[in-house]
């Protein structure tokens, strides 16, 4: 990747990622420097007859760093702080080639939950106020609510009226997704409204 257009690479929190390095064809490489946010990560001197010399210069990521046979960078047990700009400089006798990368770390979504604040009106219509959440949600998480294949909401919240006298059993499903995972959680309108009805009856007595 040229330094002007960094290659964007997705990594998953806790997993591994490889930043691929392409060599100049037919040229002898003198050394390779890997940088993270403009700070040296590693310095590699290839040898034709023996193993390359690898000098890891960043102790913070050092234990999680590895290099493939083609000196692509492998980073394991990814952390959020690994997000950022990576560069590889390949120096040959005649030139220096620069490859740029932007690594973003995405979380596998987990622990989807739905909270319910519903009301029962005098006419026995049940108004559902549902809120969906996942652990550590960020701006890259998309939420939506669906019922019978139709999207009823594109936000974590859903407000909907349900009348047991005219509506059949209805499930509402929250779907949370990002670029690397998706989760869903379904709730029954009938069940939620029955619970509200019990509370409503209890308070009336």
């Amino acid at each position: 990747q040229s330094s002007l257009t960094p290659l964007m690479v997705n990594g998953i929190l806790g997993e591994s990622v490889t930043l691929p390095l392409e060599f100049p064809a037919g040229e002898k490489v003198n050394f390779i420097t890997w940088l993270f946010n403009e700070t040296s990560l590693a310095f590699i001197v290839p040898h034709e007859t023996k193993s390359p010399e690898i000098h890891v210069t960043n102790p913070k990521q050092g234990k999680r760093l590895n290099f493939t046979q083609s000196y692509s960078l492998q980073l394991s047990n990814l952390k959020m702080e690994d997000t950022g700009s990576y560069r590889a400089q390949i120096s040959t006798k005649t030139s220096a080639k620069l490859s740029s990368y932007t690594l973003r770390i995405l979380r596998q979504l987990r622990n989807i939950q739905v909270t319910n604040h519903s009301q029962l009106f005098q006419n026995m219509t049940c108004e559902l106020h549902l809120t969906c959440s996942v652990e550590d949600a960020d701006d890259n998480v998309s939420f939506r609510w669906e019922a019978l294949g139709n999207t009823l909401s594109s936000q974590p919240n859903l407000t909907v009226s349900w009348d047991p006298r005219i509506s059949s059993e209805q499930d509402y499903t929250c779907i949370a997704e990002n670029a690397v995972s998706n989760l869903s959680f379904s709730v029954s309108a009938q069940k939620l409204c029955e619970d509200v009805k019990i509370q409503y009856t209890d308070t009336k007595m």
């Epitope: 290659l7 999207t151 909401s153 594109s154 936000q155 670029a179």
Partner: antibody
């Protein structure tokens, strides 16, 4: 039917402010996020950010932090975009667009042209 | 941010011909949306989540792709298809649009 109707064209002087409205009808306003998209003359579409119509919480793209404010009046199902300290480069068509999920904009306003000129 | 590169910038074709346009993302995305825009009009939703046609979109349109490469195809151009088509990704904030492909009459 579902529609978004935006306020009319505006001609403003540099340094002034403008408030663009987007009135929604035909659906439950608080169930769908509202996005704002800018298209400068002869240019591509640029996503400015969105507002959660249930909580009222706005989110801005980096290029639109500072002078741009998204707001709501839920009682009249209307979203607003306010731009302060207008510059000539703010001259553009501004669109509101409903998010149907996965940031797919299934309904668009007709657009509001804002012209900034001295 | 994820950069979307659309190619070609302009497609000059005649009615009845097949049109294929590409949208390449600088990073892998889960799905791509497409919009059609005609001069002086707001964009219109065209293809949702890579391959689903929006309401009212004719079956001669199709979408495909995965990862970083996505394609919109028109099997046989009709006069009303001449317009600009934009791709848009949702996987990462900010949501970004491609630069558009203009399909013009040859």
């Amino acid at each position: 039917q579902i529609q978004l109707v935006q306020s009319g064209s505006e001609l403003k002087k540099p340094g002034a402010s403008v408030k663009v409205s987007c009135k929604a009808s035909g659906y439950t306003f608080t169930n769908y996020g509202m996005n704002w998209v800018r298209q400068a003359p002869g240019q591509d579409l640029k996503w400015m950010g969105w507002i959660n119509t249930y909580s009222g919480e706005p989110r801005y793209a980096d290029d639109f932090k500072g002078r741009f404010v998204f707001s709501l009046d839920k009682s009249v199902n209307t979203a607003y975009l306010q731009i302060s300290s207008l510059k000539a480069e703010d001259t553009a068509v501004y669109y509101c667009a409903r998010d149907y999920g996965r940031w797919y904009f299934d309904v668009w306003g007709q657009g509001t042209t804002v012209t900034v000129s001295s | 941010q994820i950069v979307l590169s659309q190619s070609p910038a302009t497609l000059s074709l005649s009615p009845g011909e097949r049109a294929t346009m590409s949208c390449r993302a600088s990073s892998s995305v889960s799905h791509m949306h497409w919009y059609q825009q005609k001069p002086g009009q707001a964009p219109r939703p065209w293809i949702y989540a890579t391959s689903n046609l929006a309401s009212g979109v004719p079956a001669r349109f199709s979408g495909s792709g995965s990862g970083t490469d996505y394609t919109l195809t028109i099997s046989s151009l009709e006069p009303e298809d001449f317009a600009v088509y934009y791709c848009q990704q949702w996987s990462s904030t900010p949501r970004t649009f491609g630069g558009g492909t203009k399909v013009e009459i040859k």
